[in-house]
């Protein structure tokens, strides 16, 4: 990139530059028209009978160098050929010198600095590579010359340009003066700004631009060359924050569309929101979740929105005495998790009526919560009690969710307690074909004991056909028409409102061999 | 602004020469293109030569070959244009004009002619 | 020589007329031709150079156009101070020439 010191190409007014000295055949500013066929300012000198060394000095106006260290004169000139001018003389020339002086303000006068090369620093002698020549007959013929030179290193706050004619017939089109400068360049998302070079290479920091961050790693530098070029070499450059891609050739970083969203810093373009999400606003790094979802705490930013599910099916339940056995079916609808679980809540209410939170002597197997199959085992139901088990399925976002958690209930009601086993059976008396038979009463916890049953068999007949069975209302019994001398298994068991316990122990009697012996009390 | 100022009246016998001489004040003179153009009495332009002061030569439109001469003196800035063999015909204004721009100056020799001297008559009679 | 041919030789026009003068070269000339307006008793006063290009100073009213052999000068709204004698010139060769004139004259 070049900036512009001056141009007189541009200029519309006189330049009224300074000459010396002040003779006849200097330096004169003249109008001339350029390739564009725009009038220009220009300065021709054509003193070709000059006495030996008699210079034409032309200064220009002083220049601020704009903190340029080397700056650059372009001159558009035309030359005539010596050997064209038939009244020239020996000291004709087809070259000038080009030369500067920097000062920190604009001081120079019409007779200082002195006029020669030391003050003023020689640039370069100028040769012509066209010449405008004429020949007898014909229409006069050239081109122009561009020659470009560097003047620097400058450190002053401004300079002058000379030209120093010493003979030739020449005219000075145009002048242009500048400065390279690295052009502000934005690569991979990395600003770099305007620079101008002051040595051969210039390292520059770049910044992030508009709504990127520095990419993990050293801080990207470029270094701007002292031609106005960026040195080519790899950038470690920005990237766009979440809620932004790069766009226009990786300069810029645009906002996600509404519907998009990025949810990390980086490459990659802006996706569409996942399942359940929205986002209503450009430059979404999340994408919001719709009413009655959720994401867990663990999932990804991007990770599609979940809800909880549905309430688990079909709970069949089996009693087996104090312990049950509930198992269910999923839900319909897992909510687009997979993390599902099962927990059990439960209420007991007692025969009168009074229901409370399921006690502590319960117990769940797996557990009562953290299911992952769906099935539980609970143990330790107390007898004519009614629970209420509510099975809900949980997953992830479960805890996220307000309102009430959906739930399939089941209602059981354990049987009432039977009376316990009738154990202590003793025999009162016996004879060869009955046995007279007693025993404590058990204690029901459900009423008293309505009345017993006694099942007999003799010992060795085990089939169906050959047990026995007496009901009596007391706690005693006789059992007749037994044989004589034989063995008889008893048990006993006693009935109350809840129904038959269990039969107890198998008692063993015999009776007697013959009827001399009589009752008698047998103890068992 | 550059001034053409050019030489008096002239009455000439036919077969006589007049020199009539065109100043230019003010300026570079010598990459300038020096024009002469005569008009006669109700009649159009004509171009007789011109020349470019450094280059000494002169370039003539082919009526006037052989007869007219176009010179310069460098050192008093003034062009001269000489006719010989006048003829009757030959009685006319004769103008010098200088061209908008040096032969250095213009990357176009368009030769456009913007400063003109005012004339002299030229009268040629027996 | 290369001849240079004006054509009208005379027009009449009202002021705010709009005028075109054309210039036919006798061979290609490119864009080297120049118009002037001359009026009575005075030298000529240059208008257009290079074909097209206003001289400085020149209303802007005047235009010129044209390449090759063929080229015309236009005076888009006519001035009283416009009427005068036009003169087209060539300087393609080393020997210029002027077309004969056309003569703008009040209606």
């Known amino acids: 990139l070049e900036e512009t010191l001056l141009n007189t190409k541009l200029e519309t007014a006189d330049l009224k530059w300074v000459t010396f000295p002040q003779v006849d055949g200097q330096w004169e500013e003249l109008s001339g028209l350029d390739e564009e066929q725009h009038s220009v300012r220009t300065y021709e000198v054509c003193d070709v009978q000059r006495a030996p060394g008699q210079a034409h000095w032309l200064r220009t106006g002083w220049v601020p160098r704009r903190g340029a260290v080397h700056v650059y004169a372009t001159l558009r000139f035309t030359m005539l050929e010596c050997l064209s001018l038939p009244r020239a003389g020996r000291s004709c020339k087809e070259t000038f010198t080009v030369f500067y002086y920097e000062s920190d303000a604009d001081t120079a006068t019409a007779l200082t600095p002195a006029w020669m090369e030391n003050p003023y620093i020689k640039v370069d002698t100028v040769a012509a590579e066209h010449l405008t020549r004429k020949r007898p007959g014909a229409e006069a013929t050239g081109k122009v010359n561009v020659k470009t030179l560097r003047l620097g290193p400058l450190s002053k706050a401004g300079f002058y340009l000379a030209f120093q004619d010493q003979g030739a017939c020449m005219a000075l089109l145009s002048l242009h003066l500048f400065y390279k400068k690295c052009a502000q360049l934005t690569v991979n998302l990395t600003r770099f700004p305007e620079t101008v070079p002051r040595e051969l290479v210039v390292p520059v920091a770049g910044s992030c631009v508009v709504d990127a961050v520095p990419a993990p790693g050293p801080s990207p530098s470029l270094y701007c060359r002292e031609d106005g070029q960026w040195a080519e070499q790899p950038v470690t450059g920005c990237s766009c924050a979440p809620g932004f891609e790069a766009a226009e050739g990786n300069t810029k970083c645009r906002a996600c569309a509404q519907g998009t969203f990025k949810p990390l810093s980086g490459e990659g373009s802006c996706q569409p929101c996942p399942a359940n999400s929205h986002s209503n606003t450009i430059g979404s790094a999340v994408c919001q979740c719709r009413v009655g979802y959720f994401r867990a705490r663990t999932d990804p930013r991007g990770a599609p929105c979940t809800t909880p599910p549905s309430a688990p099916r079909s709970v069949v339940s089996r009693l087996n005495g104090s312990s049950l056995h509930l198992e269910w079916s999923a839900p319909l609808e897992s909510g687009g998790r997979e993390d599902l679980t099962y927990a059990l809540r439960c209420r007991e209410c007692r025969p009168g009526g009074s229901c409370a939170p399921c006690g502590g002597d319960l117990t769940f197997d797996p557990g009562p919560r953290d299911l992952v199959e769906p099935w539980v085992v609970v143990r330790g139901l107390r007898p004519d009690f009614t629970y209420t088990f509510e099975v809900t399925a949980l997953n992830g976002v479960s805890s996220l969710a307000t309102g009430p958690v959906p739930f399939e209930p089941v209602n059981v009601t354990t049987d009432r307690e039977v009376p316990p086993a009738v154990s202590d059976i003793r025999v009162t008396r016996s004879s060869p074909s009955s046995l007279s038979l007693a025993w404590a009463v058990p204690r029901a916890p459900s009423g008293a004991v309505l009345d017993y049953e006694v099942k007999y068999h003799e010992k060795g007949a085990e089939g169906p056909s050959s047990v026995r069975f007496l009901k009596t209302s007391e706690n005693r019994a006789e059992l007749r028409g037994l044989k004589r001398g034989a063995s008889y298994l008893v048990q006993v068991r006693a009935r109350s409102e809840a129904g038959y316990g269990p039969f107890g122990q198998e008692h063993h009697s015999q009776t007697q061999l013959d009827e001399s012996e009589g009752w008698r009390e047998q103890l068992a | 602004q550059v001034q053409l100022v050019q030489s008096g009246a002239e009455v000439k016998k036919p077969g006589s020469s007049v020199k009539v001489s065109c100043k230019a004040s003010?300026?570079?003179?010598?990459?300038?293109?020096i024009s002469w153009v005569r008009q006669a009495p109700g009649q159009g332009l004509e171009w007789m030569g011109k020349?470019?002061?450094?280059?000494?030569?002169?370039d003539y439109a082919q009526k006037f070959q052989g007869r007219v001469t176009i010179t310069a003196d460098e050192s008093t800035s003034t062009a001269y244009m000489e006719l010989s063999s006048l003829r009757s015909e030959d009685t006319a204004v004769y103008y010098c004009?200088?061209?908008?721009?040096?032969?250095?100056?213009?990357?176009?020799?368009?030769?456009?002619?913007?400063?003109w001297g005012q004339g002299t008559l030229v009268t040629v009679s027996s | 020589d290369i001849q240079m041919t004006q054509s009208p030789s005379s027009l009449s026009a009202s002021v705010g007329d709009r005028v075109t003068i054309t210039c036919r070269a006798s061979q290609n000339i490119n864009n080297f031709l120049n118009w002037y307006q001359q009026k009575p008793g005075k030298a000529p006063k240059l208008l257009i150079y290079?074909?097209?290009i206003l001289q400085s100073g020149v209303p802007s009213r005047f235009s010129g156009s044209g390449s090759g052999t063929d080229f015309t000068l236009t005076i888009s709204s006519l001035q009283p101070e416009d009427f005068a004698v036009y003169y087209c010139h060539q300087v393609s060769d080393t020997s210029d020439t002027f077309g004969q004139g056309t003569k703008v004259e009040i209606k």
């Open positions: 003010g300026g570079t003179f010598s990459t300038y293109a």
């Open positions: 004009a200088r061209s908008s721009y040096t032969i250095l100056t213009t990357y176009y020799n368009y030769n456009a002619m913007d400063n």
């Open positions: 290079g074909s097209s």
């Open positions: 020349i470019i002061p450094i280059f000494g030569d002169a």
